[in-house]
C-alpha cells in the first residue's frame, strides 16, 4: 500500500540560498553541521541529477546504519527535490521505499517554508510504523536547524559570488555564482 | 493545456481482455504519477490503479489486483492498463487522470473510454 | 480501506441558496489529505478543492472546503446555475485512494 504524510516548517533563511545550502549541497554540510546525526554522504552513482545514488551513513548509536538515496529530480527554478530512500535504514520486508518531495517555498518576510511530502511504499498489507514517521521528521528538523545555524553564523556562505579561472571552467574567467559552480562541479 | 485522451474501450464477453490507452499531452508526463479511475453506469467513481513517475512504484485496488496490469511509456507519453479475466462488473466509463505531481489528487482528466463486459 | 459516506444524497435548492455538503471518512485522514470534485452529466469530473481548503486554479471564491479528522463539509456559498452537478470527495492519505458515493445538488 501507499500512505502519505506531509508537514511544513519555517526557516528563517530566504529560500533560494536554503535551496543552494540544505538540498544542493547538503551532501557536503551535513556530516560538518550535524555529525551526530549524518556521519558521511557518499555519491555511490550519477552526478547529482535524476538517478544519482547516495549513500548516507549514520554515526554509532543511532538505530539505522545507512539509507541509499536516489535523486528522481531537482528543480533549481521552483526550488524543489524529489528523492526516494531505497535501501538501508527502513527498507526490508514490510517497506519498499519512501518517496519524498521537498519544497522550499518563499515568504513576504524574507524567510522560507519548507513543504515535505512523504509517501511510504509499503508491501503488502503492512502499516507505516509511527514512530517512524516521528524519527524522519525528527531527523529532517535536526538538519535543517543545524543547516540554518550555520547559515546564519557564515552570512557570506551560499551567497556570494566568486571569481573563478578558466582552468576551473575549460573556458574564459568568469564571475559566477555558488549555484553555478554546484552545477559545474556536481551535474 | 493538459490534454488526456483515452482509447481501447469496447464490448467485449466475460473473461475475455482488452488494452485501454491513454495519449498525453500539454505536460512533462515523466515528472507526474497517473491514474485510472472508473465510474459504473450512474454509479460513483472508483480508483483502479497508479503508477508513479518512472514505473518503480505500482498500485492497484483489490477489486483489479491480479487481473489489470498498468503500466506506462514516458517516450510516448501514454499510459496503459490491460485487462484481462474481464467481468460484467468491470463495466464502466474509464478515465485517465493526472496525478498532481507527488500526492493522489487528481488535477486533469479525460473524458473516458467505455468498457463493456457482456455475454 | 477508508471508507467516505457523503449526505445528503441528493440537494434541492434554487440559484443563489447556499449549498453545504458533508464528507464523513471512516478513520481519521491523515494531514488534510482530502479533495472536492464537481461533476456534470457526460463529462469528466473536474477538481475543486485539495489539502481540504485549498482551490484549485481557477476555482470560483464561492466554492470553500473545511474540516478535519473525519468530518468535511464543501460549501457553495451562492449557487449558480453552472453549479448544479453531482459532488464527490476523495481521501488520498492511503491506498486505496477511495470517493465518496456522491451528492446531487440539484435545482429545486
Known amino acids: 500500500g501507499v500512505f502519505n504524510y506531509e508537514t511544513e516548517t519555517t526557516s528563517v533563511i530566504p529560500a533560494a540560498r536554503l535551496f543552494k545550502a540544505f538540498i544542493l549541497d547538503g551532501d557536503n554540510l551535513f556530516p560538518k553541521v550535524a555529525p551526530q546525526a549524518i556521519s558521511s554522504v557518499e555519491n555511490i552513482e550519477g552526478n547529482g541529477g535524476p538517478g544519482t545514488i547516495k549513500k548516507i551513513s549514520f554515526p554509532e548509536g543511532l538505530p539505522f546504519k545507512y539509507v541509499k538515496d536516489r535523486v528522481d529530480e531537482v528543480d533549481h527554478t521552483n526550488f524543489k527535490y524529489n528523492y526516494a530512500v531505497i535501501e538501508g535504514g527502513p527498507i526490508g520486508d514490510t517497506l519498499e521505499k519512501i518517496s519524498n518531495e521537498i519544497k522550499i517555498v518563499a515568504t513576504p518576510d524574507g524567510g522560507s517554508i519548507l513543504k515535505i511530502s512523504n509517501k511510504y511504499h509499503t508491501k503488502g498489507d503492512h502499516e507505516v510504523k509511527a514512530e517512524q514517521v516521528k524519527a524522519s521528521k525528527e531527523m529532517g528538523e535536526t538538519l535543517l536547524r543545524a543547516v540554518e545555524s550555520y547559515l546564519l553564523a557564515h552570512s557570506d556562505a551560499y551567497n556570494e559570488q566568486k571569481l573563478i579561472s578558466e582552468e576551473d571552467l575549460g573556458g574564459e574567467q568568469k564571475l559566477i555564482s555558488e549555484e553555478d559552480l554546484h552545477h559545474h562541479h556536481h551535474h | 493545456e493538459v490534454q488526456l485522451v483515452e482509447s481501447g474501450g469496447g464490448l467485449v464477453q466475460p473473461g475475455g481482455s482488452l488494452r485501454l490507452s491513454c495519449a498525453a499531452s500539454g505536460f512533462t508526463f515523466r515528472n507526474y504519477a497517473m491514474h485510472w479511475v472508473r465510474q459504473a453506469p450512474g454509479e460513483g467513481l472508483e480508483w483502479v490503479a497508479a503508477i508513479y513517475r518512472n514505473s518503480d512504484s505500482i498500485d492497484y485496488a483489490d477489486s483489479v489486483k491480479g487481473r489489470f496490469t498498468i503500466s506506462r511509456d514516458n517516450a510516448k507519453n501514454s499510459l496503459y492498463l490491460q485487462m484481462n479475466s474481464l467481468k460484467t462488473e468491470d463495466t464502466a466509463l474509464y478515465y485517465c487522470?493526472?496525478?498532481?505531481?507527488?500526492?493522489?489528487?487528481?488535477?486533469?482528466w479525460g473524458q473516458g473510454t467505455l468498457v463493456t463486459v457482456s455475454s | 480501506e477508508i471508507v467516505l459516506t457523503q449526505s445528503p444524497g441528493t440537494l434541492s435548492l434554487s440559484p443563489g441558496e447556499r449549498a453545504s455538503l458533508s464528507c464523513r471518512a471512516s478513520q481519521s485522514v491523515s494531514s488534510s489529505f482530502l479533495a472536492w470534485y464537481q461533476q456534470k452529466p457526460g463529462q469528466a469530473p473536474r477538481l475543486l478543492i485539495y489539502g481540504v481548503s485549498s482551490r484549485f486554479i481557477g476555482i470560483p471564491d464561492r466554492f470553500s472546503g473545511g474540516g478535519s479528522g473525519t468530518d468535511f463539509t464543501l460549501t457553495i456559498t451562492r449557487l449558480e446555475p453552472e453549479d448544479f452537478a453531482v459532488y464527490y470527495c476523495q481521501q488520498y492519505g492511503r491506498s486505496p485512494w477511495t470517493f465518496g458515493q456522491g451528492t446531487k445538488v440539484e435545482i429545486k
Open positions: 487522470a493526472k496525478d498532481e505531481g507527488f500526492l493522489e489528487y487528481f488535477d486533469s
